[in-house]
């Protein structure tokens, strides 16, 4: 069952999934000047059996001008998106190595893909939030959102993360300094 809405937006924060539940779709979007190849699938789909999950279909982009040249899925190293190594990214890489049953890993980039990935999430999906670079967590309660089905409708739980750009914590005496939180997620993503 697809989630009706996008995960909630949190001011000055981005979200990321560690792994994607079977049934998740990722739009094959191309960057400006490129388009999906004619025979190409409009999306990738996370599918699997009892032992293994993987992405069905591959996204391929071709130049809008040159109609006969297709681009391969595997990106050239210099084309790969630059990623900031953060605590959350390492957590994700760790989670990637320990594959969750019934989940797919983050699909590798394809050449000339759009800068923002559009996912269609399914019920049971969890996404994790983090303050963007330059902001810190004023309050970090549960910083994740889960797509749940209630009364026949899907809804995302509300993450309890408040990010602020103010650098001086106004703390009352005797309270220890909170742990500095990592800066930002490797990439932002959206869903439709």
């Amino acid at each position: 069952e697809l989630c009706d809405d996008d995960p909630p937006k949190i001011t000055h924060a981005t979200f990321k999934a560690v792994a994607y539940k079977e049934g998740t779709m990722l739009n094959c979007e191309c960057k400006r000047g490129f388009r999906r190849i004619k025979s190409g699938s409009p999306y990738m789909l996370c599918t699997g059996n009892s032992s293994h999950s993987s992405w069905d279909n591959q996204c391929q982009c071709t130049s809008s001008a040159a109609r006969n040249t297709t681009k391969q899925v595997t990106p050239q190293p210099e084309e790969q998106k630059e990623r900031k190594t953060t605590e959350m990214q390492s957590q994700m890489q760790l989670a990637d190595q320990v594959s969750l049953p019934g989940h797919c890993r983050e699909p590798p980039p394809w050449e000339n893909e759009a800068t923002e990935r559009i996912y269609h999430f399914v019920v049971g999906q969890t996404v994790y939030y983090q303050c963007v670079q330059g902001y810190r967590a004023l309050h970090r309660g549960p910083a994740e959102s889960v797509c749940k089905m209630t009364h026949g409708k899907t809804r995302w739980t509300q993450p309890q993360l408040i990010c602020t750009g103010e650098t001086e914590p106004s703390q009352f005496p005797g309270e220890e300094e909170p742990q500095a939180s990592p800066d930002g997620l490797p990439e932002s993503e959206t869903s439709r």
Epitope: K9, L138, H139, G141, Q160, I162, P169, Q171, F172, P178
Partner: antibody, heavy 115, light 107 residues
Framework: QVQLQQPGAELVRPGVSLKISCKGS????????MHWVRQSHAKSLEWIGV????????LYNQKFKGKATMTVDKSSSTAYLELARLTSEDSAIYYC????????WGQGTTLTVSS | DVVMTQSPASLSASVGETVTITCRAS??????LEWYQQKQGKSPQLLVY???TLAEGVPSRFSGSGSGTQFSLKINSLQPEDFGTYYC?????????FGGGTKLEMK
């Protein structure tokens, strides 16, 4: 069920300070930040600030800096709003509200400052 | 500070009618907007958060829409318990600010 309990009313003399309490129950207190909001006839609803119930880190509306101080006591699951040097202008209803979306509110403390 | 302007300031309607309340932000608030209902002598109650998500337990006759600077709250088929004052509030950056309120009265 989730409850935010506040004292119903306070009557104080001008010039004094007052600490209003807001006790959370029915949920994990430190999971949700606590906001404070003022309601007066003149100004409708005004956001005073927000405090992390976990770390005690607070963020204030510039307008209330020097007037309001927010604190928390995790052991009793209580948030406090201290108002300094009270004047008749501070007479209003003061609410605590929970979390990012203010999903639960206390019943409000009606403050009357009068000599 | 972001100024939230609500209109109308007051509104008379009958049970069964559909009403729409609007809220305009002086700056882009994206979808960081909540709607609250307040009954006389009671504290405000969350109706809608993030511009369009209904809070738990809120009847489906309520719906929120809009983004950026223009937002609206629609109530289909008004019920007797819907009369009261409605407030919008943005939470994109501090200070969070509220609209002046719309008082919905029974005609």
């Amino acid at each position: 069920q989730v409850q935010l309990q506040q004292p119903g009313a306070e009557l104080v003399r001008p010039g004094v300070s007052l600490k209003i309490s807001c006790k959370g129950s029915g949920y994990t207190f430190t999971d949700y930040a606590m906001h404070w909001v003022r309601q007066s006839h003149a100004k409708s609803l005004e956001w005073i600030g927000v405090i992390s119930t976990y770390s005690g880190d607070a963020l204030y509306n510039q307008k209330f800096k020097g007037k309001a101080t927010m604190t928390v006591d995790k052991s009793s699951s209580t948030a406090y709003l201290e108002l300094a040097r009270l004047t008749s202008e501070d007479s209003a209803i003061y609410y605590c509200a929970r979390g990012v979306t203010f999903d639960y509110w206390g019943q409000g403390t009606t403050l009357t400052v009068s000599s | 500070d972001v100024v939230m302007t609500q209109s109308p300031a007051s509104l008379s309607a009958s049970v069964g009618e559909t009403v729409t309340i609007t809220c305009r932000a002086s700056e882009n608030s994206y979808s960081y907007l909540e709607w609250y209902q307040q009954k006389q002598g009671k504290s405000p109650q969350l109706l809608v958060y993030n511009a369009k998500t209904l809070a738990e337990g809120v009847p489906s006759r309520f719906s929120g829409s809009g983004s950026g600077t223009q937002f609206s709250l629609k109530i289909n088929s008004l019920q007797p318990e819907d009369f009261g004052t409605y407030y919008c509030q943005h939470h994109y950056g501090t200070p969070y600010t509220f609209g002046g309120g719309t008082k919905l009265e029974m005609k």
